[in-house]
Amino acid sequence: MMTGTIETTGNISAEKGGSIILQCHLSSTTAQVTQVNWEQQDQLLAICNADLGWHISPSFKDRVAPGPGLGLTLQSLTVNDTGEYFCIYHTYPDGTYTGRIFLEVLESSVAEHGARFQIP
């Protein structure tokens, strides 16, 4: 039975040209995390494999950085980065847990700064 839950940063906003940290945290399970995948809509951005470490998708290497922890840092944000992001925790023996984050990239300098884990 899958008992775990994923806590995420939820809905967050950031300014165009800035950076943001996407964070998920898996709790309430003793399952072993074998890999975490970070996805944006239909694209895999990065993976963090327990054995092999971090690997950033070649098409995102210039704008995505690993961490902190199992999180992901997006840099040089554009309005096109607005959308849904997913953290997929592959675990043993539980299976897969998925968390969702919605990022809005704002043109103006009035981006809300209330979200946790956000880079000032």
């Epitope: 694209q43 895999l44 494999n49 054995d51 092999l52 470490g53 070649p58």
Partner: antibody, heavy 117, light 107 residues
């Protein structure tokens, strides 16, 4: 020029072990994964396992766990794949490949391993 | 393990015509699919990564598409040197499983 040069063909008896080497050159050995893939006669390509030469971390396909060991020697930029308890079904061409996790961009020339009594 | 199912098993196409190969994943793999060309007596060669990105030096007659579970490799105008077996492979999670291969021949 990136190159992966594998050791020569091997003939082994059932129950024996084989160790295939893969010498890398032309790039920073510790910056890429080394993957091992095999192809038995008439079969599809089969991924066996991978090593991160920088950290030494390995990941194996479940069916090979306990029978395969992948290692890397940073000083000589060489990766090794050892397969034990050989059986006839292990007769195949074994390839090493440089991995970016998301793809394998350079491959060794392949090493034919024949298991026969 | 994620199962990659390729179709068709073999394909005979006239020179200059289009060849289309399909690959279906047993579960979601995002765009983490690569395509390889394998000729007899040679090592496999990378053609496409991340479903649709052409690898350096690969002719532009090769293209890839798809996301989620369904993927396609297209050779827009088949050349004699394209006769080979083509494999898809998922890189979404280990083990990085391959499809069964599609043999492309000249009609």
């Amino acid at each position: 020029e990136v190159q992966l040069v594998q050791s020569g063909a091997e003939v082994k008896k059932p129950g024996a072990s084989v160790k295939v080497s893969c010498k890398a050159s032309g790039y920073a050995f510790t910056n890429y994964l080394i993957e091992w893939v095999r192809q038995a006669p008439g079969q599809r390509l089969e991924w066996m396992g991978v090593i991160n030469p920088g950290s030494g971390g390995t990941n194996y396909k479940e069916k090979f766990k306990g029978r395969v060991t992948i290692t890397a020697d940073k000083s000589s930029s060489t990766a090794y794949m050892e397969l034990s308890s050989l059986r006839s079904e292990d007769t195949a061409v074994y390839y090493c490949a440089r991995g970016e996790y998301f793809f394998f961009d350079y491959w060794g020339q392949g090493t034919t391993v024949t298991v026969s009594s | 393990d994620i199962v990659m199912t390729q179709s068709p098993d073999s394909l005979a196409v006239s020179l200059g015509e289009r060849a289309t190969i399909n690959c279906k994943a047993s579960q979601h793999v995002s765009n983490a699919v690569a395509w390889y060309q394998h000729k007899p007596g040679q090592s496999p060669k990378l053609l496409i990564y991340s479903a649709s990105y052409r690898y350096t030096g690969v002719p532009d007659r090769f293209s890839g598409s798809g996301s989620g579970t369904d993927f396609t490799l297209t050779i827009s105008s088949l050349q004699a040197e394209d006769v080979a077996v083509y494999y898809c492979q998922q890189h979404y999670n280990t083990p990085h499983t391959f499809g069964g291969g599609t043999k492309v021949e000249i009609k």
